[in-house]
Amino acid sequence: EDWQCPRTPYAASRDFDVKYVVPSFSAGGLVQAMVTYEGDRNESAVFVAIRNRLHVLGPDLKSVQSLATGPAGDPGCQTCAACGPGPHGPPGDTDTKVLVLDPALPALVSCGSSLQGRCFLHDLEPQGTAVHLAAPACLFSAHHNRPDDCPDCVASPLGTRVTVVEQGQASYFYVASSLDAAVAASFSPRSVSIRRLKADASGFAPGFVALSVLPKHLVSYSIEYVHSFHTGAFVYFLTVQPASVTDDPSALHTRLARLSATEPELGDYRELVLDCRFAPKRRRRGAPEGGQPYPVLRVAHSAPVGAQLATELSIAEGQEVLFGVFVTGKDGGPGVGPNSVVCAFPIDLLDTLIDEGVERCCESPVHPGLRRGLDFFQSPSFCPNPPGLEALSPNTSCRHFPLLVSSSFSRVDLFNGLLGPVQVTALYVTRLDNVTVAHMGTMDGRILQVELVRSLNYLLYVSNFSLGDSGQPVQRDVSRLGDHLLFASGDQVFQVPIQGPGCRHFLTCGRCLRAWHFMGCGWCGNMCGQQKECPGSWQQDHCP
């Protein structure tokens, strides 16, 4: 019988304790928000917000500029000064709640927890390959704003998500804020609103459309806005909220809210419940039918998918898919099964389900007893009636009112439970060649870069490494700059190549040469490395 090389177990062919050092920036405080800008002329920047300060970094993560955003009432606050002589509100620290780009101007918009949640607009001024911020403009007109009607009150101290959409020659801010009774009473930022930036950058247009949790539900019904994004003709918000207005408020589930990105109005506001489950291949006795529910979304990202995953999801390559990391409860604590699961929801399918739900509500024959839902936003009603009305009047349309779609969209864990004890806290998905890669940050400060495929019983790692020695959780929001992703952990921002930090964690030549082409790995004497690390012979074709 022929002698064969003993097979190296797959897990033994890599070492995830290998140290990788990636470029980083120490922000001087817990990173609260981060956004990147890439201009057409090779200029780029990273904007990093911490309490009372906004940093501008160059593409090399070196500091270019720093701006004091608080405390409110402090003479050193540079943004506050843009609003003219104060006082403008109670003194206090500014925690950045919103940091977004208006690409048309181009400008950075920052909104904080102080000064009624107002925003500041910072025009971007390219200087070589770096970018500077012009003097801030205060997006607040005192005479237009009252506690009960405040178009310029955008950010909630409890959390706000914003997506900026260009329509014609104007910018619309799609805003979603978490509320409670105290926040709602003090210059209420509203739950969901669409606001239009005024042409003179003095604030937002006075007439804006909004939905808000009704006063009677504010104490018991809180909505957390986890993520927002714009793709195609719609803006989407992802929420974690109580499953029912009347039942136990700790029984949470995840919803997707859809708003039109082409018509800045809320008549076609729709919600759909997203259901993510872990369904092990061999079901244990007593395990729930259809799999164990993971109802609470932790992080999400949408991206076009590569060929292989597209085939597995029965969609076309390049189609947009929403990926979500789900946990069993708010604390994300251990239960039976993995700590985190990842589900994939193709956007076209989401839209189809929503449209079918509208048909069920509005096209006769309407199923008796079908509710319009969203009773926390509007008066209860049955389809096809508008909220709070017993019947449709001739000049109203069933479709012109918000609706919770009666069915949910159910998916199972793409990783088949293989994330195990890992608690995922950040997610960004990219397509590299025809491969779809999930870049995940974890509770213990690691980065996992894993191919998204569902057909395997092991994880295909691009990398799995520790960002530093602090072991602090990687924060939810991830930004992309060129071929790098920016992750925040504690007071640090880290720049991670999307192709992975290197190849040294592959221990055998065979494993090294089987690495994805985009990683650029080759065998280099006795280690796996990239060509730039290899002064001697570097081999991508065969093993010695």
């Epitope: 181009p106 042409a199 003179d200």
Partner: antibody, heavy 117, light 111 residues
Framework: EVQLQESGPSLVKPSQTLSLTCSVT????????WNWIRKFPGNKLEYMGY???????YYNPSLKSRISITRDTSKNHYYLQLISVTAEDTATYYC???????????WGQGTSVTVSS | DIVLTQSPASLAVSLGQRATISCRAS??????????MNWFQQKPGQPPKLLIY???NQGSGVPARFSGSGSGTDFSLNIHPVEEDDTAMYFC?????????FGGGTKLEIK
């Protein structure tokens, strides 16, 4: 100081293509919106279309099948092409910048184009 | 398309007096609490100049003598006191709906 300058032929034959260039100084065409407007001999102004900071275009539907607006960011120029011109396209053509809501705050001096054989 | 009708077509006003030019839109040009009406001045041999945007906001470097007002469908441009240099054509422009459209113009002469 932002300045725009139109250039191109002053005489175009019917059925041919009118091609104009707008050269921009003092601002980058990678921010804001860059418009074309024309004024007919009887003083009537017509909005033609724009190219945005990102290269996105909008065309007046009355011209949609005939108009194209492009740009060259390396030169900071943007361009107008109008195909199959007739005598009705005789006008003064202006390029103009807007930051918001078609409020065009900087204009070129205009270039007069006559369509005639 | 929204049609803008300017009146009068021409206007002669004495030096130092008030000139009022009206612009009526075929449909409401307000949205989000803003009136999407701009006003331009054009002198012979020159390009148009932005005077007023969003119905009542003065363009950069525009003298305070120029003011705009109105909402819905009815708008006006006021010049007070008029100066000799104000001899020009004045155009209104709506930007609520695409395509943006212009009024037919009003010719102002100073007596």
């Amino acid at each position: 100081e932002v300045q725009l300058q139109e250039s191109g032929p002053s005489l175009v034959k019917p059925s041919q293509t009118l091609s104009l260039t707008c050269s921009v100084t003092g601002d980058s065409i990678t921010s804001g919106y860059w418009n074309w407007i024309r004024k007919f001999p009887g003083n009537k102004l017509e909005y033609m279309g724009y190219i945005s900071y990102s290269g996105k275009t909008y065309y007046n539907p009355s011209l949609k099948s005939r108009i194209s607006i492009t740009r060259d960011t390396s030169k900071n120029h943007y361009y107008l092409q109008l195909i199959s011109v007739t005598a009705e396209d005789t006008a003064t053509y202006y390029c103009a910048r807007s930051k918001y809501d078609y409020a065009m705050d900087y204009w070129g001096q205009g270039t007069s184009v006559t369509v005639s054989s | 398309d929204i049609v803008l009708t300017q009146s009068p077509a021409s206007l002669a006003v004495s030096l130092g007096q008030r000139a009022t030019i009206s612009c009526r839109a075929s449909e409401i040009v307000d949205n989000f609490g803003i009136s999407f009406m701009n006003w331009f001045q054009q002198k012979p041999g020159q390009p148009p100049k932005l005077l007023i945007y969003a119905a009542s906001n003065q363009g950069s470097g525009v003298p305070a003598r120029f003011s705009g007002s109105g909402s819905g469908t009815d708008f006006s441009l006021n010049i007070h006191p008029v100066e000799e240099d104000d001899t020009a054509m004045y155009f209104c422009q709506q930007s609520k709906e695409v395509p943006p459209t212009f009024g037919g113009g009003t010719k102002l002469e100073i007596k």
